[in-house]
């Protein structure tokens, strides 16, 4: 990871650091949630498997006007090797299931914590 979606950095960011920072941002979102996150917007659920970073970004990028997740969107783009735009969907989406952004963030956070604890950064 040479950069994190537009974040200025003095050099390559180690994958472990990038993942840790993403986890910490998701924690911040979860902890600071007062009103329904992103006004209760719904997003496609994803399979938390290989390629999930792009799939997560594809889901979240369709939420507009929600400043709370803008940093997460930028960070996820640093993990996804291709450019993602709104309306784009991969096979990793569970296209018959939509969940609230808050639940999506919670599920993603737990999965990333597990990966990080086990030392799986890529």
């Amino acid at each position: 990871l040479t950069c994190l979606g537009g974040f200025a950095s003095p050099g390559p960011v180690p994958p472990s650091t990038a993942l840790r920072e993403l986890i910490e941002e998701l924690v911040n979102i979860t902890q600071n949630q007062k009103a329904p996150l992103c006004n209760g917007s719904m997003v496609w659920s994803i399979n938390l498997t290989a390629g999930m970073y792009c799939a997560a970004l594809e889901s979240l990028i369709n939420v507009s006007g929600c400043s709370a997740i803008e940093k997460t969107q930028r960070m996820l783009s640093g993990f996804c090797p291709h450019k993602v735009s709104a309306g784009q969907f991969s096979s990793l989406h569970v296209r018959d299931t939509k969940i609230e952004v808050a639940q999506f963030v919670k599920d993603l956070l737990l999965h990333l914590k597990k990966l990080f604890r086990e030392g799986q950064f890529n």
Partner: antibody, heavy 120, light 107 residues
Framework: QVTLKESGPVLVKPTETLTLTCTVS????????VQWIRQPPGKALEWLGV???????SFNSVLKSRLTISRDTSKSQVVLTMTNMDPVDTATYYC??????????????WGQGTLVTVSS | DIQMTQSPSSLSASVGDRVTITCLAS??????LAWYQQKPGKAPKLLIY???RLQDGVPSRFSGSGSGTDFTLTISSLQPEDFATYYC?????????FGGGTKVEIK
């Protein structure tokens, strides 16, 4: 009020299987992770494994082949099973709740612990 | 595995003393460190998590600092109920690991 309570045998024989139950109240197993830790008499603490809130488990690799963790959410119980017990496994076994909404894993509530002695 | 080394292993102090316990991680754990207090026959009690965040109900005389590999627990003015064993714990990588403990005794 958050509480956790371990229950199970106080004495097991070498080669036998230990089964300990952690019964929790004041929180949901689907919202919080439950960790298992043990402490041999007069020694430091050792992490055994975790039951994640989504039902997944992770273990200390040193003991992974001997451990299983399961749960019954309807009974608010988490069960630790440890096979092939040895006298060196004599310890106080604790279950504890994970702080969860944090980037790190820590233990904010603990059971009172149950001393398990392994002896023939 | 990440090794956690506490020092000293024991210390003697008087009521009112300032007490400092250190914890050294074998590799960088950011600020993913917690401190616990344990009294004989009792379960550990969480004092501090994320290096410096005080758990609800814990007196403000307890404080934590550090980052990376070096961490400190400070008791600003030791009280009679503070005589106990203290453990650090890293919550960064599995297996989660604890320090060997520091026993704080009455001088």
């Amino acid at each position: 009020q958050v509480t956790l309570k371990e229950s199970g045998p106080v004495l097991v024989k070498p080669t036998e299987t230990l089964t300990l139950t952690c019964t929790v109240s004041g929180f949901s197993l689907t919202n919080y992770h439950v960790q298992w830790i043990r402490q041999p008499p007069g020694k430091a603490l050792e992490w055994l494994g975790v039951m994640w809130s989504d039902g997944d488990t992770s273990f200390n690799s040193v003991l992974k082949s001997r451990l299983t963790i399961s749960r019954d959410t309807s009974k608010s119980q988490v069960v630790l099973t440890m096979t092939n017990m040895d006298p060196v496994d004599t310890a106080t076994y604790y279950c504890a709740r994970d702080g969860t909404i944090a980037a790190m894993d820590y233990f904010d509530y603990w059971g009172q612990g149950t001393l398990v002695t392994v002896s023939s | 595995d990440i090794q956690m080394t506490q020092s000293p292993s024991s210390l003697s102090a008087s009521v009112g003393d300032r007490v400092t316990i250190t914890c050294l991680a074998s590799e960088d754990i950011s600020n993913y460190l917690a401190w616990y207090q344990q009294k004989p026959g009792k379960a550990p009690k969480l004092l501090i998590y994320h290096t410096s965040r005080l758990q609800d109900g814990v007196p403000s005389r307890f404080s934590g600092s550090g980052s990376g590999t070096d961490f400190t627990l400070t008791i600003s003015s030791l009280q009679p109920e503070d005589f106990a064993t203290y453990y650090c714990q890293q919550g960064y990588r599995f297996p989660l690991t604890f320090g060997g403990g520091t026993k704080v005794e009455i001088k």
